[in-house]
């Protein structure tokens, strides 16, 4: 038998909150559990769904979840079925609504001394408790001639008088929560002695020096007073006009006339009506001076034939808002057709070449008129005047490739070299007519070139192959001065290129032949073991049939690398004494010695009286000062190599000898003393 271990039970629930109806069964076989609501099966949704055997509610809904729920367990094999006890929700809720007029039937029927009933359409369960408000202030029972039942949703005013006028709102609360009226009711009960608006002044826009009229009328019993004020609360009357309102006239019917309006007259005017009773009624209107700004410039436009294009005219800022229209050849454009005006836009449908020309946008208001022209060009596809042709260009000379085309507007020409866009630099120049100039043609310029001539209407292109007629040249040119280390192997390369592969040979500049230990192998001069007799001038000669021969002269120096015979040592010297930094170097060619102190080269011609560099390279500094301290670098260099060595110089104060020290006591440092 199927047994319910847990059965659903009726319970309180809150609108929009979670809830759970529990159901647990025990049975010998496999059972299938489902739920019924008022006898109909419950379908799972995101809001309400089965969770195990229980029914879970993500958000209780007072409309969809009202009724009786029942848990049903069924054994599909035996057909046995068991049903739980019924369960339902006591759903607590509250929902806002408007304040509405219940009696009389319409607002038009509200008269002084009649009964007025307002109803608060806030509903809820349990039944809410209501509170009424006038102009935000709570109303209590029996207050000022009105009967209020806070248990009820009705507010009765009997009888209703002008003092009951105001904005009525209500709030209600119950166990679920609180809500206030979604729409409030304004009760307006006229008092004959209150000033009432008959004709309100309207904002006015006038051109400078024109006239402006404000109308204003109130009614009341007895008739009300009417007064005009301007901006700074200055009263305007026919007897006392403020200085800046000399041309103001107030008529008997309340209208205000301003003549020959100036900018200082612009501003807010107030018309005030005061009845025998009640508050003053203040009406405002603004006098604006008409104005119109300049229009922004149009960029020239280029369109293609057959397309549809639009040009928007941004109206200038102005008061009142300017009206806008387009003209072409002095004629206003229609609002339909192939070329027409739509709103502020100029529309050109299926553009023809004949549509090219100047179109004018006009804007006008009370303050005046503005206009702005736009130049419209109808683009055409370029046509050839001269295509680029396959060319032979000489290396080292300028070369030209032509790409001459014509179109409207003037076409732009770009060149590609091996499919790569050519950007103008010191070697490539594209002239205004599209011709490409290659300055100083190089061998690798021999490739495909393509020019593309374009307008917005389309483009044409053509390509040409460039063949470079290579000049006879050394690649690279041999260094004119080269050094070889004595008694070492050395090579001096020489290579050349030309239209035909050149032959290369070396010879001594004096014409003598190369000694047997020096070989010339395909342009590389090879010294197996450099002797001093190998020093001198050599010539590399490159030649071919069509281009003749070229020569490169090389002076070879036989060198012995620089060695320091004497290097400067770390030296400490008393202030005021003399410092000697020794440096001797030898090498072949004989090296020159330079000194660097404090990161600057010491120029022997600008050393001053305290410093001196001897012939042998040693540096002497007399009368040393603390600022002479630092690193000193001896640099030995010749035309073949350079070497340097450095040592620090420390300048110290001479210590005051203590009594215990004899005259022969050694100084506390390894010193140079003079």
């Amino acid at each position: 038998a199927i047994v319910f271990i847990k059965q659903p039970s009726s319970q309180d629930a809150l609108q929009g909150r979670r809830a759970l109806l529990r159901c647990e069964v025990e049975a010998p076989g496999l059972v299938h559990v489902y739920w019924l609501l008022d006898g109909a099966p419950v379908q799972d949704t995101e809001r309400r769904f089965t969770q195990g055997s229980s029914l879970s509610f993500a958000a209780v809904d007072r409309l969809q979840d009202s009724g009786t729920f029942q848990c049903v367990a069924r054994d599909d094999v035996t057909g046995e079925e068991a049903r739980s006890a019924n369960a339902s929700f006591n759903i607590k809720w509250i929902e806002a609504g408007p304040v509405v007029l219940k009696h009389p039937a319409s607002e038009a029927e509200i008269q002084p001394q009649t009964q007025v009933t307002l109803r608060c359409h806030i509903d809820g369960h349990p039944r809410p408790t209501y509170q009424w408000f006038r102009d935000g202030t709570p109303l209590s029972d029996g207050q000022s001639n009105n009967t209020v039942s806070s248990k009820e949703r009705n507010l009765t005013l009997r009888p209703a008088g002008p003092e009951h006028s105001g904005l009525y709102s209500c709030c209600a609360h119950n166990a679920f929560g609180q809500a206030c009226s979604s729409q409030n009711f304004t009760l307006s009960i006229a008092d004959e002695s209150f000033a009432r608006v008959v004709l309100a002044p309207q904002d006015v826009i006038v051109a400078r020096n024109e006239e402006a009229m404000f109308h204003c009328q109130f009614s009341a019993q007895p008739p009300p007073n009417l007064q005009w004020l301007f901006e700074d609360e200055t009263p305007i009357t026919n007897r006392s006009r403020p200085p800046h309102l000399r041309r103001a006239t107030v008529f008997a019917n309340g209208s205000l006339l301003l003549t020959q309006v100036r900018p200082r007259n612009a501003g807010v005017y107030r018309c005030i009506g005061q009845g025998q009773r009640g508050p003053p009624v203040i009406l405002e209107a603004t006098l604006h001076l008409a104005e119109i700004e300049d229009m922004p410039l149009f960029e020239p436009r280029v369109f293609t034939a057959g397309s549809e294009e639009r040009v928007t005219c941004l109206p200038p800022k102005g008061l009142p808002e300017p009206s806008v229209w387009w003209e072409h050849a002095g004629v206003r454009l229609p609002t339909h057709g192939r070329v027409y005006q739509k709103g502020h836009e100029l529309v050109l449908a299926s553009i023809a070449e004949s549509d090219a020309g100047v179109y004018t946008c006009h804007a006008a208001n009370l303050a005046g008129q503005r206009r702005q022209d736009v130049n419209i060009t109808v683009a055409t596809v370029p046509t050839w005047l001269k295509k680029p042709q396959d060319s032979q260009l000489e290396e080292g000379k300028p070369g030209y490739l032509h790409c001459l085309t014509q179109a409207t507007p003037k076409p732009t020409v770009v060149w590609y070299r091996n499919q790569m866009l050519i950007s103008e630099d010191s070697r490539f120049e594209v002239f205004k007519n599209g011709t490409l100039r290659i300055n100083n043609v190089e061998v690798y310029d021999g490739t495909w070139y393509r020019c593309v001539s374009s307008t917005p209407a389309g483009s044409i292109e053509a390509q040409a192959r460039v063949q470079v007629l290579e000049k006879l040249k050394f690649t690279p040119p041999p260094q004119p001065q080269q050094c070889m280390e004595f008694d070492k192997e050395a090579t001096v390369p020489c290579s050349a290129t030309g239209r035909e592969k050149p032959t290369i040979k070396w010879e001594r500049a004096d014409g003598s032949s190369l000694p047997e230990w020096v070989t010339d192998n395909a342009g590389t001069l090879h010294f197996a073991r450099v002797t001093r007799d190998d020093a001198g001038n050599y010539t590399c000669i490159a030649s071919n049939g069509p281009q003749g021969q070229i020569r490169a002269h090389v002076q070879l120096t036989v060198a012995v690398f620089i060695t320091f015979k004497v290097e400067p040592e770390r030296t400490t010297v008393y202030q005021g004494h003399t410092a000697l930094l020794q440096c001797e170097a030898q090498g072949d060619p004989k090296p020159l010695i330079q000194w660097k102190g404090k990161d600057r080269i010491l120029d022997p011609t600008k050393l001053g009286p305290r410093m001196h560099i001897f012939q042998n390279g040693s540096l002497v500094i007399h009368d040393v000062a603390p600022e002479d301290s630092g690193r000193y670098t001896c640099i030995a260099g010749n035309s073949c190599n350079i070497k340097h060595t450095e040592a620090p110089l420390y300048v110290v104060d001479k210590p005051v000898p203590e009594e215990s020290e004899g005259p022969g006591s050694p100084p506390p440092y390894k010193m140079i003393q003079t």
Epitope: F486, D487, T531, R532, V558, F561, I562, T563, F564, Q586
Partner: antibody
């Protein structure tokens, strides 16, 4: 002050080997070329071999080529001469000499020498 | 190889007198690039290693007395001791360092008469 001290000399039979060393001090050994020069008893001076400051080049007199090997260890400031297949005519005082620079073949400092006697 | 020939083989000179030693090279040792003669003179006293006296044919090594002087150019060179002193008794060698291998003269023995 520059000092060169040779060692490793002695009496050796023909065809045998001997290794001479020269310990250097008082200068930057790795900046100078180094040579071996020999002097047979009662005879003049004969240049034997050179090694450059960096050990990159080595040259020999024709009389010892293929038998003697010059080498140096700049980290130990030491020069070596490996003498193989010694002959009677190799008998001499062997001097280690410093080059005037890197490769001048001019000798500004000499060691006291070590005597090598090749005799059966 | 450049052959160096010294003369005389030996020389006896009175104390305070001038001694002159000659050296001849089989090839020019004057280097045109710097106009220097690649020739040196050494002094070897009995039981001692040689000692550099003069290089560039005429430049005295530091510490060498000025009574020693060198001269000559190209292939012919001379070492002169202007006033012989007792400590100058030695064998004197010339050497070329113009080309490899470096070669020495046979030596000149200087004695006191």
């Amino acid at each position: 002050q520059v000092q060169l001290v040779e060692s490793g000399g002695g009496v050796v039979q023909p065809g045998r080997s001997l290794r001479l060393s020269c310990a250097a001090s008082g200068f930057t050994f790795s900046s100078y070329g180094m040579h071996w020069v020999r002097q047979a008893p009662g005879k003049g001076l004969e240049w034997v071999a050179v090694i450059w400051y960096d050990g990159g080049n080595k040259y020999y007199a024709d009389s010892v080529k293929g038998r003697f090997i010059i080498s140096r260890d700049n980290s130990r400031d030491t020069l070596y001469l490996q003498m193989n297949s010694l002959r009677a005519e190799d008998t001499a005082v062997y001097y280690c000499a410093r080059d005037w620079g890197s490769s001048w073949y001019l000798f500004d400092h000499w060691g006291q020498g070590t005597l090598v006697t090749v005799s059966s | 190889d450049i052959v160096m020939t010294q003369s005389p083989d030996s020389l006896a000179v009175s104390l305070g007198e001038r001694a002159t030693i000659n050296c001849k090279s089989s090839q020019n040792v004057l280097y045109s690039s710097n106009n220097e003669n690649y020739l040196a003179w050494y002094q070897q006293k009995p039981g001692q290693p040689p000692n550099l006296l003069i290089y560039w044919a005429s430049t005295r090594e530091s510490g060498v007395p000025d009574r020693f002087s060198g001269s000559g150019s190209g292939t012919d060179f001379t070492l002169t001791i202007s006033s012989l002193q007792a400590e100058d008794v030695a064998v004197y060698y010339c050497q070329q360092y113009y080309s490899t291998p470096p070669t020495f003269g046979g030596g000149t023995k200087v004695e006191i008469k």
